[in-house]
Interface confidence: low
């Protein structure tokens, strides 16, 4: 075209993908008359003939423009919607007379790309690689024209760094004619990195001006060495036999090493492997006395196999061991004294305390009890109690028995007991004295005894109620070394009128029964015994 | 000896969800990762994804995003598969691996025994 | 994602002579030194076994009659002198970037 050269820069135009761009046709009237006036599109130098306008009426062509073009403007401004990026390129108004002239306009597209995306590499990098690792790849998806990305670390921009820092960056056309770009950072880190917070942004152009997006912050998981381990004991503070006691080892290595603990055998000095659980903690359940000991910790990092030993950590488990109190069995006459002495080992000081048994009530705070002018109700359970006040729930106890001597005392003197014939009467009858007595009934009957404690008996009789039963009564005697005593028991025929409604019932057992610290007490049911067989 | 058990056969329906286990005995469970596999009958082998029991963090290949989950019990050295919303093609067998993994590795070195899920209606 | 593909599908060898299987990656799988390439013997009923790791390196308690070769993205599984007990599926897998992918595996019938 004559005088192409000297043509002026043409008219730049910005919009962004999807809306409308206004092509005004900047020809004066002395260059051309706008109501006839030919539109092209200018491709890689070639020209397509794109719209006429003829006497003020416009006309696409047919082609990928004829369905976007619309005249505006009394005809001066050529309106494209719906631009897409392939719309990128030069448009041209050509006027016919007086004579041929033309006015060019540069169109630019732009899209924001999507928020980027960024992956970090969840293999982990190794530190002191040969060479630098992926940490993380971004992706900044349907932006136009091609974003520029920035990769941050800790907020700080990264440079390429030769052997460092490389950053790899590739774009796609998508089917939109949009641009895809995937950005690879690769780097060399160190153990510091570890808690690096690494993110990419994404810079980009519209006709509004300059922006940026930027990704979350990632951190990538990253391999070092082990140069520390230590043990750690849980729960922490006082340990008590009984306790749950864990035994772990930490290092400062990733991933850790493998770890063994070892215990110093106190009599050779040698350190001697433990038997740790799946997760390599060693659980002492229940922690007892021998547990307490020196404690170490070895990890093995299997890269180098490099063994690194932690500091040794003594470990007590507090223990009170077992009670012993003097004298052991006491006997004593009544309206003498006693003192009772209690004595236990702790790896903590100690407090005694003496305990009624039957009645819970302390009697004295130190390990020594002193009874004086003892009563017969003196005899029975006394309970040495040996804690440690430090360490709540450490305690061991003792009970002894305290006998008084004396002859047998019976939990009653007399009683009635309700009964029918033929029945079968459960009795019993309870003393207590020391020496411990021994029961014997003025009936036949089957008889059974139980020694309630190291004073007391309880003895039963099953027996059938009989005429001469009835007439005699039944009497139980208790009898030890130092006398004998006894108990009677008053049988009386039920009326049918004083029955219970329960009281007929073919399975029960008739029982009285008496304890020297409950009122006495009787119930009688009755239990049929089978007729004799006839003989035919 | 190092071991990883895992839980019984399941027949499930469309829709319902199963929790496959994976008890690990025989070695640290926190050094090693769990990769899980999955092989469709007379199929290949198709990774799945896997857990770092270290931090519990759990990754997943694109094919199993959404419906599939990965989760541990340390204490009792297990990890788990959860498989939501069951579909026809979930039928398979599912396989746990222990993951080598460290500086210079990435192995699967030892497998369950594998647990057959089996999805009819 | 890293396509590996497994060559022959199948093959049958007589017992005593040497197996070749070969894995071709789509894209390499070795860097710093490393290839991420891993052999795998599965017979039916059970459990993938691992065999080699890191391309070359034989596993604790596996046969030395089986050797891995090849960096890049070409690798080879050897086994010589083949074994009745060696008739299985074997496949071949990388580990060198997410996801991890299984060729598509090559069963050995054994003559």
């Known amino acids: 075209v004559p005088g192409e050269a000297e043509q002026p820069a043409p008219e730049l135009v910005e919009v962004e993908v999807g809306s409308t761009a206004l092509l005004k046709c900047g020809l004066s009237q002395s260059q051309g008359n706008l109501s006839h006036v030919d539109w092209f599109s200018v491709h890689k130098e070639k020209r397509t003939l794109i719209f006429r306008v003829r006497q003020g009426q416009g006309q696409s062509e047919p082609g990928e423009y004829e369905q976007r073009l619309s005249l505006q403007d009394r005809g001066a401004t050529l309106a494209l919607t719906q631009v897409t990026p392939q719309d990128e390129r030069i448009f041209l108004c050509q006027g016919k007379r007086p004579r041929s002239q033309e006015y060019r306009i540069q169109l630019r597209v732009y899209k924001a790309p999507e928020e980027p995306n960024i992956q970090v590499n969840p293999l982990g990098i190794p530190v002191n690689s040969k060479e630098p690792e992926e940490v993380a790849t971004c992706v900044g998806r349907n932006g136009y024209p091609i974003p520029q990305v920035i990769w941050y670390k800790n907020g700080r921009p990264l440079k390429e760094e030769k052997n460092r820092v490389h950053i790899q960056s590739s774009q796609t056309v998508e089917s939109s004619g949009l641009y895809t770009l995937q950005s690879i950072l690769k780097a060399q880190l160190v153990k510091e990195d570890k808690d690096a917070q690494f993110y990419c942004e994404l810079n980009y152009r519209l006709p509004s001006g300059n922006h940026m997006k930027e990704s979350r912050e990632v951190t990538v998981p990253v391999f070092y060495p082990t140069e520390k381990v230590w043990l750690e004991v849980e729960p922490v503070g006082m340990l008590k036999e009984g306790d749950r006691v864990e035994i772990r080892c930490l290092a400062d290595g990733n991933p850790p090493p493998h770890f063994s603990i070892s215990k110093q055998n106190p009599s050779t000095r040698e350190a001697e492997e433990e038997t740790t659980n799946d997760n390599g903690v060693l659980v002492l359940e229940p922690a007892r006395k021998e547990h307490s000991g020196r404690y170490e910790c070895q990890g093995l990092d299997l890269d180098t196999m490099i063994s690194l030993l932690s500091e040794p950590q003594e470990l007590l488990v507090n223990y009170v061991s077992d009670v012993r109190v003097s004298p052991a069995a006491p006997e004593r006459q009544e309206g003498s004294s006693l003192t009772l002495t209690c004595e236990a080992e702790s790896s903590q000081d100690l407090e005694f305390q003496w305990l009624r048994e039957e009645t819970g009530q302390v009697l004295e705070r130190g390990p020594v009890l002193q009874l004086h002018d003892l009563k017969r109700e003196a005899g029975g359970g006394y309970r040495c109690v040996a804690s440690v006040p430090s360490i709540p729930g450490l305690n061991r106890t003792q009970l002894v028995n305290v006998a008084i001597f004396g002859p047998p005392w019976m939990a009653f003197k007399e009683r009635k007991v309700w009964v029918k014939e033929n029945m079968v009467l459960n009795l019993s009858c309870e003393a207590s004295g020391h020496p411990r007595p021994t029961i014997s009934w003025n009936v036949n009957g089957t008889a059974s005894e139980q020694d309630q404690d190291p004073q007391r008996v309880l003895s039963t009789l099953n027996v059938l109620v009989t005429p001469e039963l009835l007439e005699t009564g039944v009497e139980c005697t208790a009898s030890n070394d130092l006398g004998k005593n006894t108990s009677i028991l008053f049988l009386e025929l039920v009326n049918l009128t004083t029955l219970t409604p329960d009281s007929n019932t073919t399975t029960g057992l008739s029982t009285s029964t008496a304890s020297p610290h409950t009122r006495a007490n009787s119930t009688s049911t009755e239990r049929k015994l089978p007729e004799p067989e006839s003989r035919g | 000896q190092i071991q990883l058990v895992q839980s019984g056969p399941e027949l499930k329906k469309p829709g319902e969800t199963v929790k496959i286990s994976c008890k690990a005995s025989?070695?640290?469970?926190?050094?090693?990762?769990m990769n899980w596999v999955k092989q469709a009958p007379g199929k290949g082998l198709k990774w799945m994804g896997w857990?770092?029991?270290?931090?519990?963090?759990?990754t997943y290949a694109d094919d199993f995003k959404g419906r599939f989950a990965l989760s541990l019990e340390t204490s009792a050295s297990t990890a788990y598969l959860q498989i939501n919303n069951l579909k026809n093609e979930d039928m398979a067998t599912y396989f746990c691996?222990?993951?080598?993994?460290?500086?210079?590795?990435?192995?699967?070195?030892?497998w369950g025994q594998g647990t057959s899920v089996t999805v009819s209606s | 994602d890293i396509v590996l593909t497994q060559s022959p599908a199948s093959l049958a060898v007589s017992l005593g002579q040497r197996a070749t299987i070969s894995c071709r990656a789509s894209?390499?799988?070795?860097?710093?030194?490393?290839?991420?390439m891993y052999w795998y013997q599965q017979k039916p009923g059970q459990p993938p076994k691992l065999l080699i790791y890191?391309?070359?390196n034989l596993e604790s308690g596996v046969p030395a009659r089986f050797s891995g070769s090849g960096s890049g993205t070409d690798f080879t599984l050897n086994i010589h002198p083949v074994e009745e007990e060696d008739a299985a599926t074997y496949y071949c897998?990388?580990?060198?970037?997410?996801?991890?992918?299984f060729g598509s595996g090559t069963k050995l019938e054994i003559k």
């Open positions: 897998q990388h580990s060198r970037e997410l996801p991890f992918t």
């Open positions: 691996a222990r993951y080598r993994y460290n500086k210079y590795e990435r192995a699967m070195d030892y």
């Open positions: 890191l391309a070359s």
């Open positions: 894209k390499s799988v070795s860097t710093s030194g490393y290839s991420y």
């Open positions: 025989g070695y640290t469970f926190t050094n090693y990762g």
């Open positions: 857990i770092n029991t270290y931090t519990g963090e759990p």
